[in-house]
């Protein structure tokens, strides 16, 4: 029967008693930094050429046995998880394996940035079709090893990386921290973390997603028809690398921010024990468990947007944190939160030609962090439009006034330590969706963007009772672009993007009391784009 | 129910080429190896080799390379072992059996074709 | 290539008594990553194919009767016949499938006394 894994990451329509993806990923060459490998086992023979780079340390400890199945073991194993011709995700696609880890495991920063660059080369001299590159390991963080990264992704090429396996917070680590490459926690036959002997899977804002990584059947180097289970975020790594594969087998023009924004949408959501990471760790985590797409083409027509969360901003009076989108993504929407409840809110602005989502700290505050909504919206055109804090008693407002522009998101952002403890709620007027409005001691930005077809509205969600969390989420068919708290709801810690849904959060509610102080309503801002779905629907 | 019918008794000279067949039902043919094993007349059995219908890939056991083709058509679920130019000592029956890769144990046996090979 | 060789090349057993079979493997086939014995005992009666008894060494195929047994491990295995049944008559093979090429023993046949 299927094992666990690849029952895990198929949908339900392609369920069976075996495992048949529809497309195997034949379009694609996958790269494996890895140790070396047993190239004539059954199970990956003829799909991975075993190039000639070797750039390893020498082994540790001066009785060092080296044994080849053993030298062989990760690097085998997670060749036939990618593409294994039994218990591979993508059984189509090819590899090619370059030597980074020694027979203990242990690699370089220079053998990676070696390995990298010899990819680079080859990509140079030879140019093939879409190129994934897997990366299954993790080390101290390294600047050096995140930028070598940066430009390989920049240059077209697709990167996922294992998380690591240390409990600990993955941007710690490289090259999980690097932004541009897609990294991958390891999830088991529970949907829960991965616990490792004393260890586990690493977790937090670095993460992208999780996928099956623990008790995972793949080659064995032991022999050439042997299966062994081996369990780690490699071997999550190396799920999402298949399923990369196949995506790109289906839709080889996809860009790597194409690539990730789909992996997230067809994940499963909101499955994962979050009890497990650390409690400053959980917000930040994606909930996220890889999974193929029902059908490898025609998800062209929807908007996809992924929240981004900055690193914290320290809790300095004048600290801010800032949130970027990739390259290819639109920011349209910013929001902060802060565990103190202490912030002066967060606003949308240009840094080298592009828009930043920035939260500020505010005194006695532990720190902030910047969340981005992240879009992918082709032919947009965004701007921010500011109002300055107001004087009149209704509060600041402001809206889209170009034709043709939409709002997106509301940010609000202020000078004063205590806005909002002892004010009134300002209500919206009703009829103006196209309208963010704040206090009138803050500044409001609107993200207003016009691109083809693009419709939006605001939903909103009001408890009068005070509640720690309130929600408001988009209907299908609608992607959330904007998450924010009403102004006059006091004790807010902020608002976030999960998956299609505005998360407001608010101060424990033993410490506050019942009036009307404790309102808390949250506003979403859903959008959808006509423009996509009827292109989507001419292709087919 | 799981089977392989392989195709019928051949009676050919020596210096005739002869293709017999396998063909798999009941499970997903692509998805097993289909191994190929001999056994002359009062002998034991002999591995010949596989192949992974799914991409074709086959591995033969060296005492066989170059003496027989293994392939398969999996549009149909058929494998198929084929000679170029018999001789009289290639006189045997011939087995088709399943595999799959984490149990690399023949769990499915074909009925076997009778190849006698006679001037 | 392994060598396989099993041990005795015919036996005839009063019907009710125990048959042991031996296979000897020229080098181990015991993997220690997934502790596992790639070792299979197969059933042959006259003019029919092969049946699959026993795999990893002593796990039983689904539908053959508990009087087969497999045991052994590394390089000594044993198929017993705990009660031998007349439709036990037949020549039962062992075959390693840890490495190419796959090889199986000589054959023991079984026979009633």
């Known amino acids: 029967s299927i094992p666990w894994n690849l029952e895990r990451i198929t949908p339900p329509r392609y369920r069976a008693d075996e495992y048949q993806p529809p497309d195997g990923g034949s379009l694609v060459e996958v790269y494996l930094l890895d140790t070396s490998i047993q190239s004539d086992h059954r199970e990956i023979e003829g799909r991975v050429m075993v190039t000639d780079f070797e750039n390893v340390p020498e082994e540790d400890g001066t009785r060092f046995h080296r044994q080849a199945s053993k030298c062989d073991s990760h690097g085998t194993h997670l060749a036939g998880v990618v593409s294994g011709r039994d218990a591979g995700v993508a059984k189509g696609a090819s590899m090619r394996s370059l030597r980074v880890l020694n027979c203990q495991g242990k690699g370089t920063v220079s053998g990676t940035l070696i390995g990298l660059e010899f990819i680079r080369k080859s990509q140079l001299v030879q140019p093939v079709g879409p190129l994934v590159v897997l990366l299954p390991l993790a080390g101290g963080y390294s600047r050096v090893l995140n930028a070598a990264c940066q430009r390989l992704a920049r240059a077209g090429v697709v990167l996922v990386t294992a998380a690591g396996n240390f409990r600990d917070d993955a941007c710690l680590y490289s090259p999980a921290s690097a932004p541009e490459v897609i990294t991958v926690g390891a999830t088991n036959a529970q949907d829960q973390p991965v616990t490792l002997g004393t260890l586990g899977t690493n977790f937090g804002r670095c993460v992208d997603l999780f996928a099956p990584g623990e008790d995972i059947i793949g080659a064995s180097s032991d022999c050439s028809t042997c299966f062994v289970s081996q369990s780690g975020t490699s071997q999550a790594a190396a799920h999402v690398a298949g399923i990369a594969a196949m995506m790109l087998s289906a839709e080889p023009e996809l860009t790597l921010a194409e690539l990730r924004q789909r992996l997230i949408h067809f994940s499963a959501k909101d499955v994962i024990n979050e009890a497990w990471f650390p409690e400053d760790q959980r917000v930040l985590t994606p909930n996220l468990v890889a999974a193929l797409p029902p059908s490898t083409h025609g998800a062209g027509w929807q908007l996809f947007c992924r929240t981004v969360w900055s690193a914290h901003s320290g809790p300095t009076r004048m600290a801010t944190a800032v949130a970027r989108c990739a390259p290819d993504e639109e920011l349209l929407s910013c929001s902060s939160f802060s565990r103190s409840g202490k912030r002066r809110g967060e606003r949308m602005e240009a840094q080298g030609g592009k828009l930043v989502c920035r939260a500020h700290n505010a005194f006695g505050g532990e720190g902030v962090y910047a969340i981005a909504r992240c879009c992918l919206l082709p032919q947009a055109n965004c701007s921010v439009h500011t109002a300055p804090p107001a004087e009149a008693s209704m509060g600041t407002r402001v809206h889209c006034h170009q034709q043709g522009h939409v709002l997106t998101g509301c940010s609000s952002h202020w000078e004063v330590e205590d806005l909002g403890t002892h004010k009134p709620p300002v209500l919206r007027p009703r009829g103006q969706p196209n309208q963010c409005v704040g206090h009138r001691e803050a500044s409001i930005h609107a993200s207003c963007c016009h691109a083809p077809g693009l419709e939006c509205k605001v939903k909103e969600h009001g408890i009068p009772a005070p509640q720690e969390q309130v929600t408001v989420a988009c209907e299908e068919g609608w992607t959330l672009t904007g998450c924010s708290a009403l102004p006059g709801t006091s004790h807010v810690l902020g608002a976030y993007a999960v998956d299609n849904t505005c998360v407001v959060r608010s101060r424990d509610v033993s410490t506050t009391g019942s009036t009307s102080e404790g309102a808390v309503t949250a506003v979403a801002i859903c959008c959808r784009s006509r423009h996509l779905a009827q292109a989507s629907q001419e292709l087919q | 129910q799981v089977k392989l019918v392989q195709s019928g008794a051949e009676v050919k000279k020596p210096g005739e080429s002869l293709k017999i067949s396998c063909k798999g039902s009941?499970?997903?043919?692509?998805?097993?190896?289909i191994a190929w094993v001999r056994q002359m007349p009062g002998k034991g059995l002999e591995w010949m080799g596989i192949?992974?219908?799914?991409?074709?890939?086959?591995h033969y056991n060296p005492k066989f390379q170059g003496q027989v083709t293994i392939s398969a058509d999996k549009s149909i679920s058929t494998a198929y072992l084929q000679w170029s130019s018999l001789k009289a000592s290639d006189t045997a029956m011939y087995y088709c059996?399943?595999?799959?890769?984490?149990?690399?144990?023949?769990?499915?046996w074909g009925q076997g074709t009778l190849v006698t090979v006679s001037s | 290539d392994i060598v396989m060789t099993q041990s005795p090349d015919s036996l005839a057993v009063s019907l009710g008594e125990r048959a042991t079979i031996n296979c000897r493997s020229s080098q181990s086939v015991l993997y220690s990553s997934n502790n596992k014995n790639y070792l299979a005992w197969y059933q042959q009666k006259p003019g029919q194919p092969p049946k699959l008894l026993i795999y990893w060494a002593s796990t039983r195929e689904s539908g053959v009767p508990d009087r087969f047994s497999g045991s052994g491990s590394g390089t000594d295995f044993t198929l017993t016949i705990s009660s031998l049944q007349a439709e036990d008559v037949a020549v039962y093979y062992c075959?390693?499938?840890?490495?190419?090429?796959?090889?199986f023993g000589q054959g023991t046949k079984v026979e009633i006394k």
């Open positions: 192949i992974y219908p799914g991409d074709s890939y086959t």
């Open positions: 059996a399943r595999d799959h890769g984490y149990k690399p144990f023949s769990d499915i």
């Open positions: 075959q390693q499938y840890s490495s190419f090429p796959i090889t």
């Open positions: 009941g499970y997903s043919f692509t998805n097993y190896y």
